[in-house]
């Protein structure tokens, strides 16, 4: 049996043009599903907002390395994959689409879910 068949899929259709202050970030997700138009990083802010960022940008690569290091320092075993609702208020400066697919993204976080706003949800067959 495939794992987590109905896990949500987050897709990014555009990236933030602004560099987010590192101090505002709590976690990130890697988006790699072939159902999405491009690979992406979704940063989750401390206010539970989700921001799509270009994983090729040097600042994005630096930020996710810092988040990885901080994550390991704070709680080494709390990495988990997204299988619940998106943890977000309306995403910043981006279009973010939700679809249903097994293990669409990998989340790096220590916090629990909050209500998702302004994100469409469709089922992919």
């Amino acid at each position: 049996q495939p794992d987590a068949v109905n896990a949500p899929l987050t897709c990014c259709y555009s990236f933030t043009s602004k560099m987010i202050p590192m101090s505002r970030l709590e976690s990130y997700k890697r988006i790699t599903s072939s159902r999405c138009p491009k690979e992406a990083v979704v940063f989750v802010t401390k206010l539970k907002r989700e921001v799509c960022a270009d994983p090729k940008k040097e600042w994005v690569q630096t930020y996710i390395k810092n988040l990885d290091r901080n994550q390991m320092r704070s709680e080494p075993t709390t990495l988990f994959k997204t299988a619940s609702a998106l943890r977000s208020s309306a995403p910043l400066n981006v279009k973010l689409t939700r679809k249903s697919e097994a293990n669409a993204s990998t989340t790096f976080s220590t916090t629990t879910s909050s209500t998702s706003v302004g994100v469409t949800s469709v089922t992919v067959n």
Epitope: T32, S34, D68, L79
Partner: antibody
Framework: QVQLVQSGAEVKKPGSSVKVSCKAS????????MHWVRQAPGQGLEWIGR????????KFDPKFQGRATITADTSTSTAYMELSSLRSEDTAVYYC??????????WGQGTTVTVSS | DIQMTQSPSSLSASVGDRVTITCKAT??????LAWYQQKPGKAPKLLIS???SLETGVPSRFSGSGSGKDYTLTISSLQPEDFATYYC?????????FGGGTKVEIK
């Protein structure tokens, strides 16, 4: 659906060069990195290097720096890997793969390169 | 460069067995570890990324764990289609490096 289709098998003489192609469909190669990995007969996997097709920037394992060249043609969604000064130890299956994060979720079928006099 | 040491290099097991493969990095790779399965004459197939995250369509009998320098791939109940060679790979820093592989054979 993402698909990577590689060019056919090659037999080369020592000292010569080989150029392997990898045509991508189902994705815009400008949005990812294209990597090259090789596997000698009965051996493990070895990363050669990668290209950012959007700007042509490359990164190599120091072992291949200067001998490997990776290029990409975004108009045809094709990545290329050329290896020069071939020796018998370069006999291997060469794979292209995609992945912006450094792991590889889609792979080509592999191209066998045999270096023999 | 970060070296990856995989063990065992080969193992014999029966259908239904629980199989564990380990991978050790020469430095902390902060969970940036991938596991691949490769069958003869085929390209590797990504099973797990980020040390624990199962790829789409990969059966739940596969799981990954670990942190820091030490990581594990577990197959909870070996199936006939699981006989293959498994590789770990670190993607913390380039050059990206693979473990030497573990061949899982039929006992």
């Amino acid at each position: 659906q993402v698909q990577l289709v590689q060019s056919g098998a090659e037999v080369k003489k020592p000292g010569s060069s080989v150029k392997v192609s990898c045509k991508a469909s189902g994705l815009n190669i400008k949005d990812t990195y294209m990597h090259w990995v090789r596997q000698a007969p009965g051996q493990g996997l070895e990363w050669i290097g990668r290209i950012d097709p959007a700007n042509g920037n490359t990164k190599f394992d120091p072992k291949f720096q200067g001998r490997a060249t990776i290029t990409a043609d975004t108009s045809t969604s094709t990545a290329y890997m050329e290896l020069s000064s071939l020796r018998s130890e370069d006999t291997a299956v060469y794979y292209c793969a995609r992945g912006v994060f450094g792991f590889f979720d889609y792979w080509g079928q592999g191209t066998t390169v045999t270096v023999s006099s | 460069d970060i070296q990856m040491t995989q063990s065992p290099s080969s193992l014999s097991a029966s259908v239904g067995d629980r199989v564990t493969i380990t991978c050790k990095a020469t430095e902390d790779i902060y969970n940036r570890l991938a596991w691949y399965q490769q069958k003869p004459g085929k390209a590797p197939k990504l099973l797990i990324s980020g040390a624990t995250s199962l790829e789409t369509g990969v059966p739940s009998r596969f799981s990954g764990s670990g942190s820091g320098k030490d990581y594990t791939l577990t197959i909870s109940s070996l199936q006939p289609e699981d006989f293959a060679t498994y590789y770990c790979q670190q993607f913390w820093s380039a050059p990206y490096t693979f473990g030497g592989g573990t061949k899982v054979e039929i006992k």
